[in-house]
């Protein structure tokens, strides 16, 4: 059968029918349903929601919907022994204590099982000592402290403001600096937008609001006790001392009311420059310790959280493909939340739910996609991307042979200004073409395309008339699919205006105030931005699953490879003496990129011309496209990060959320001037150039004519 016969409806009608079936009102209804109680990973409430979603996806018409469970390491506060931080006087008396919980939002005062703010996976401990303010606790902040200001954090408790980088990187940096505890806080400079009221009167963070979150440094490992393998019934588990990525010092988060009390007494060195000052009425002195009158007072942490192996549940739905059932397009997003999950994750889960409903409606009318679509509701994302990673570990052999694409579906909104897309270069043209066909929801762009409003509000820094599309980093469930398995991946959501809003993320992120009302009152009352995101995510899945030729353009990879090679060469050339001394050459990399560009161009020409009615040739060409992303995987992984195997992209070693290009070379060059053995360090740079050049050349050859 031809593809059109197999799928009953003509391709153009399919896509239109699918998109027309998506309704803002349904997304609103689903969001309300998913946010009335907390759905913390490992709890009964989240298990019940998994079963509800399973049941509803079956009703919507999927072929099968199964729960996939794993027993993974999670972390919870001790219910009878709360975590807090004190200021103690010279006699050891607690003269100030931080709050034990966030004041609940109106209407939620009687909700039980709201987990108090905590840093997941913090070890237990009661360290006491002098405080050092370390700004955002980024690599460069510790360089400034240790190298320029000669401030030693060893044996100190550090206080860092949230923002700029993943909190796990902050904790790692503090550990490496010798700190014995970490206090994380939300500064109004980063989490309070000027001119907006605090929740419940606006979308800003109140002084008692606190950001929860895990502080692991897993580097893609998944469950800390079973790296590389699923945490199933017969799993061999590491001892806690050998667990991957656990922090070694106590960590606790606080709000800015409590932070004010700690920071207002700080003495020692003045802040090095204005970039170290937040918006509190405190001096932002670095310390160590408190100023004159308070110099005998210390800070003490009281952390009693426990790590527990706990059962988690993914929901996996299948819509079997009519023509290529052994080719999988995956739409996945997490279900677990820190509290109500008004934005993270349920604004995404509600969109996935509506996408499933729309696909189900088409299926009930006799349609099937060309390829199989898998839908996933992941568990324990907030605890380190555990549900998605364990499932991918369990199914890795199938995924590496059959995985066409993964589309992520966490929070649909982090603002309401414009679209934000991060994806593999293979999907650039898909995203461009799709957004040209969708209507913009933005004020002032009535009757205009989404592409037009997006390009106007978020222009590409390199190509005029095109929108910005960013590199994939991590911090979400696409990680295992892209960084470990090399499956083409993408994500889309509505975002803020980064130029006018300098706060990090959205102010109420991971707080108790992330409610349904936050979204319905302040972010998207008409749910039009949610609908647009549903159309983008759903439209991408539809095209990936249904187009006869996969909608991947390998020429776009050639363009970015050149850009990344230019960038890393420029970084390296900042050390010209060493480049000359150690004969460091980028010739092999530039040559490989040139070859890739030429071969990709020829492949694209063949793609236009081949006989699409020949199913063998069609499958062959599609397989070359599908396996191109896979060709960038190095089976040995990156140095000290075996589960980050993509040679072109990896999460930054300094910020898990950010993507880095040619990460092997980048990390080898990073701070190379401080290395004790320059010959060895530059030898590693040369080795990484070799690995990158080989990988690009090998990937190019997968696009050559097969014989």
């Amino acid at each position: 059968k031809s593809s059109n016969e197999a799928t009953n409806i003509t391709p153009k009608h399919n896509m239109k029918a699918f998109l027309d079936e998506l309704k803002a009102e349904n997304i609103k209804k689903f969001l309300y349903n998913f946010t009335q109680i907390p759905h913390l990973a490992g709890t009964e409430q989240n298990f019940q929601l998994a079963k509800q979603i399973q049941s509803q996806w079956k009703e919507f018409g999927l072929d099968s919907v199964e729960l996939a469970h794993y027993d993974v390491l999670l972390s919870y506060p001790n219910k009878t022994h709360p975590n807090y931080i004190s200021i103690i006087n010279e006699d050891g008396n607690e003269i100030f204590n931080t709050s034990l919980f966030e004041p609940p939002p109106p209407g939620y005062e009687n909700v039980s099982d709201i987990v108090p703010p905590f840093s997941a996976f913090s070890p237990q401990g009661m360290p006491e000592g002098d405080l050092v303010y370390v700004n955002y606790a980024r690599t460069e902040d510790f360089f400034k402290l240790e190298r320029d200001m000669k401030i030693n954090c060893s044996g100190k408790i550090v206080i860092a403001r949230y923002g700029k980088v993943f909190r796990g990187n902050k904790v790692k940096n503090a550990q490496l600096a010798g700190a014995k505890g970490v206090i994380l806080y939300s500064d109004p400079a980063d989490y309070f937008a000027p001119g907006v009221k605090s929740y419940p009167d606006g979308w800003n963070l109140p002084g008692g609001g606190v950001q929860r979150g895990n502080i692991l440094n897993l580097n893609g490992a998944g469950d800390p006790l079973t790296p590389g393998y699923p945490a199933n019934e017969y799993a061999y588990r590491r001892g806690i001392a050998e667990a991957v990525g656990l922090p070694s010092i106590p960590v606790h988060p606080i709000g800015y009311y409590d932070a004010q009390k700690l920071l207002e007494k700080m003495g020692g060195s003045a802040p090095p420059d204005s970039s170290w000052r937040g918006s509190l009425k405190v001096p932002y002195n670095v310390g160590p310790g408190f100023t004159g009158n308070f110099s005998t007072q210390k800070v003490k942490m009281h952390i009693h959280s426990t790590n527990e192996v706990t059962r988690i549940y993914n929901v996996i739905g299948t819509l079997r493909g009519a023509v290529e059932p052994d080719r999988y397009v995956i739409l996945g997003g997490h279900r677990d939340s820190w509290v109500f999950g008004g934005i993270d994750p349920q604004s995404g889960a509600a969109v996935v739910h509506e996408i499933v409903r729309s696909f189900g409606t088409l299926k009930k009318e006799g349609w099937r996609p060309r390829r199989t679509i898998l839908f996933a509701s992941w568990d324990a994302e907030e605890f380190g991307l555990l549900g998605s990673t364990e499932w991918a570990e369990e199914n890795s052999r199938l995924l590496q042979e059959r995985g066409v694409a993964y589309i992520n579906a966490d929070s649909s909104i982090e603002g309401n200004y414009t679209l934000r897309v991060d994806c593999t270069p293979l999907m650039y043209s898909l995203v461009h073409n799709l957004t040209k066909e969708l209507k913009s929801p933005d004020e002032g762009f009535e009757g205009k395309s989404l592409y037009e409003s997006w390009t106007k509000k978020s222009p590409s820094p390199e190509f005029s008339g095109m929108p910005r599309i960013s590199k994939l980093g991590s911090g979400n469930d696409f990680e295992v699919f892209f960084q470990r398995l090399g499956i083409a991946s993408g994500r889309a959501r509505y975002t803020k205006n980064w130029e006018t809003n300098k706060f990090s993320g959205y102010p109420l992120y991971h707080s108790v105030y992330e409610t349904y009302e936050l979204v319905e009152k302040f972010y998207d009352p008409m749910f039009k931005y949610h609908l647009t995101v549903a159309q983008v995510r759903g439209g991408m899945v539809f095209e990936l699953a249904n187009s006869i030729v996969l909608p991947f353009d390998c020429r776009d990879y050639a363009v970015v490879l050149r850009k990344y090679a230019d960038k890393i060469y420029s970084i390296s050339m900042k050390h010209p003496q060493e480049m000359k001394t150690y004969s460091v050459s980028f010739d092999s990399l530039f040559s490989a990129v040139k070859n890739f560009t030429e071969i990709a161009s020829k492949f694209s020409e063949r793609l236009q011309d081949f006989d699409k009615s020949n199913p063998i040739v069609l499958r062959m060409m599609n397989d070359q496209l599908m396996f191109l992303e896979r060709a960038f995987i190095d089976p040995l992984g990156l140095p000290d990060r075996p589960f980050y195997r993509h040679v072109i992209y990896a999460p930054s070693s300094h910020n898990k959320y950010a993507g880095e290009s040619f990460p092997g070379i980048y990390d080898a060059l990073f701070d190379i001037e401080s290395k004790v053995d320059p010959s060895k360090a530059w030898g590693e740079v040369k080795r990484q150039i070799y690995v990158a050049a080989f990988t690009v050349q090998a990937a190019a050859e997968t696009l050559s004519e097969v014989a």
Epitope: K563, Y569, P576, S585, D587, F590, K594
Partner: nanobody, 113 residues
Framework: EVQLVESGGGLVQPGGSLRLSCAAS????????MSWVRQAPGKGLEWVSS????????DYADSVKGRFTISRDNSKSTLYLQMNSLRAEDTAVYYC??????WGQGTLVTVSS
């Protein structure tokens, strides 16, 4: 064989301008990022600027930012460095660099009153 030949150096007064050129041959010029590196008398090598495959992607040392402009003409296989508001501390031999290992012979720029 890769060849890089710099020209355009000379003596110039402080505040003056010069334009350096680097004629490239023996390789596919447009496929490579290129750089300028300088060496002041009695000093080590100092990176000045790099350029990618087009004139959009450029990078400069802080010491020359806003005064120097790197550019390229792929059709002529030539790299340029436009140097404005020259200072005495810009006095150096300026080298054109291909991939880290292929260097020109250099051209001397002297800034003096």
């Amino acid at each position: 064989e890769v060849q890089l030949v710099e020209s355009g150096g000379g003596l110039v007064q402080p505040g003056g301008s010069l334009r350096l050129s680097c004629a490239a041959s023996g390789f596919s010029f447009s496929s490579y990022a290129m750089s300028w590196v300088r060496q002041a008398p009695g000093k080590g090598l100092e990176w000045v600027s790099s350029i990618g495959d087009n004139n959009n992607s450029t990078d400069y040392a802080d010491s020359v930012k806003g005064r120097f402009t790197i550019s390229r003409d792929n059709s002529k296989s030539t790299l340029y460095l436009q140097m404005n508001s020259l200072r005495a501390e810009d006095t150096a031999v300026y080298y054109c660099v291909k991939d880290g290992v292929h260097w020109g012979q250099g051209t001397l720029v002297t800034v003096s009153s």
